[in-house]
């Protein structure tokens, strides 16, 4: 997260880290005791999933292996359309005050809605600085019409933009797959942005979760 702040401890109990060995690979969101939602571009053969801690590499955090993941069938590596994936945990999480599932959206929030995005991604760009603490940024949803003025054809129909005018605050490498939460519901998954990160007036781009609720529910049901 560029130009963010340290999240209030325990305020994101649904936030998970997808680790490759013990290195951060991507963020993710707990949606069920067996399931983590993340970005399709975060796909690996297997994952070490850290839950229940705001510190990356926390020895006291729950760590669960995951060997199965289900990318949206329409995902494109080139255009990033349908950049959404479900990761099935090999064993169920132990729910607690530190580990909770996020609330999936009942509706799509409108432009102007205040939201918070979180992650352990680099806080500087192009030179990288990875924080140990979970970082947050407060952003507002931006209409597709406004966002298309910046990204033109790069912006797909199920992509959601968020940012703050004239501000550098944004997501960056390592934040991918993490949650954009608005009014206590999951509205976005970190998908992409301009590199180097933090270009003022270049919004962060997210997968618009409200458009995928049916796919999420059906995929979890199919692979129970």
């Amino acid at each position: 997260i560029i130009d963010g702040y340290k999240c209030k401890e325990g305020s994101h109990p649904w936030q998970v880290a997808l680790l490759k060995g013990n290195q951060l690979h991507c963020g993710g969101v707990l949606v069920d005791k067996y399931w983590v939602l993340t970005a399709a571009h975060c796909k690996m053969g297997q994952y070490q999933v850290q839950l229940g801690s705001d510190k990356i590499g926390d020895q006291s955090a729950q760590k669960i292996k995951a060997t199965k993941s289900f990318r949206h069938p329409g995902y494109s590596t080139k255009t990033h359309v349908n950049d959404i994936m479900l990761v099935r945990l090999d064993e169920p999480v132990k729910m607690s005050s530190k580990v909770e599932a996020v609330q999936l959206p009942e509706h799509c929030e409108p432009p102007g809605t205040s939201c918070t995005v979180s992650g352990w991604g680099t806080t500087t760009s192009p030179d990288v600085t990875f924080p140990s603490d979970l970082m947050c940024s407060d952003v507002k949803l931006i209409s597709s019409r406004e966002c298309k003025k910046v990204y033109k054809d790069l912006l797909g129909k199920t992509m959601l933009c968020a940012g703050i005018p004239d501000s550098k605050t944004n997501t960056c490498n390592g934040d991918s797959g993490g949650p954009l939460v608005c009014n206590d519901t999951l509205q976005g998954l970190v998908s992409w942005g301009t590199y180097p990160c933090g270009q003022p007036n270049d919004p962060g781009v997210y997968t618009q979760v409200c458009k995928y609720k049916r796919w999420v529910m059906e995929t979890m049901k199919t692979h129970r």
Epitope: H41, H80, Y151, L154, S176, P196, D202
Partner: antibody, heavy 122, light 107 residues
């Protein structure tokens, strides 16, 4: 289809400034997510990234050339330019302009100009 | 700067042969690795991006693999039109850097 075309003098005297312009057609230079780059290739040698500019004017340069390089953009003309000062014979190369798709997820040079040979000689 | 070491610097193979080029980065670059083809007197052309993704319109005989520091570029069945120099390029960090190139010739 995006097309890039380099223009400028093919011969520059030592100690002078090399100036090249790249004209972009078939796409807007003001598109977010794309940087506009200069890359050079010494005769019979490999490729060297010189630097890139964003539509906003934000620039990134190769540290090995930074003290001598200026890249600018003119969005109204859909052009960007390279200036390389205090040139020597070692700056003789084919200069390419290119578009770089630069996202957090992937970054690559997808469109290139045909290149222009610049010779530094008195 | 990240150094990219490409090998071999040149190779000669017969039409129909499988050709393999390797590229090694001086530090971990995840999958931010691209491959380009350059024919004499022409600009480079993108073939593979993100280590393994084939650019639109590029024949499927070209492929790429690898992650971290070690990468491979393969032409499954060499064709006469594949005579060119091939370059790898890292896009993990600025400054972007290229390998020294591999010149591919037909025996």
């Amino acid at each position: 289809q995006v097309q890039l075309q380099e223009s400028g003098p093919g011969l520059v005297k030592p100690s002078q400034t090399l100036s090249l312009t790249c004209t972009v057609s078939g796409g807007s230079i003001s598109s977010g997510g794309y940087y506009w780059s200069w890359i050079r290739q010494h005769p019979g040698k490999g490729l060297e990234w010189i630097g890139s500019i964003y539509y906003s004017g934000s620039t990134y340069y190769n540290p090995s050339l930074k003290s001598r390089v200026t890249i600018s953009v003119d969005t109204s003309k859909n052009q960007f330019s390279l200036k390389l000062s205090s040139v020597t014979a070692a700056d003789t190369a084919v200069y390419y302009c290119a578009r770089a798709k630069q996202l957090t997820t992937h970054r690559y040079f997808d469109y290139w100009g045909q290149g222009t040979l610049v010779t530094v000689s008195s | 700067d990240i150094q990219m070491t490409q090998s071999p610097s040149s190779l000669s193979a017969s039409v129909g042969d499988r050709v393999t080029i390797t590229c090694q980065a001086s530090q971990d670059i995840a999958n931010y690795l691209n491959w380009y083809q350059q024919k004499p007197g022409k600009a480079p052309k993108l073939l593979i991006y993100d280590a393994s993704n084939l650019e639109t319109g590029v024949p499927s005989r070209f492929s790429g693999s690898g992650s971290g520091t070690d990468f491979t570029f393969t032409i499954s069945s060499l064709q006469p039109e594949d005579i060119a120099t091939y370059y790898c390029q890292q896009a993990s960090d600025l400054p972007f850097t290229f390998g020294g190139g591999t010149k591919v010739e037909i025996k």
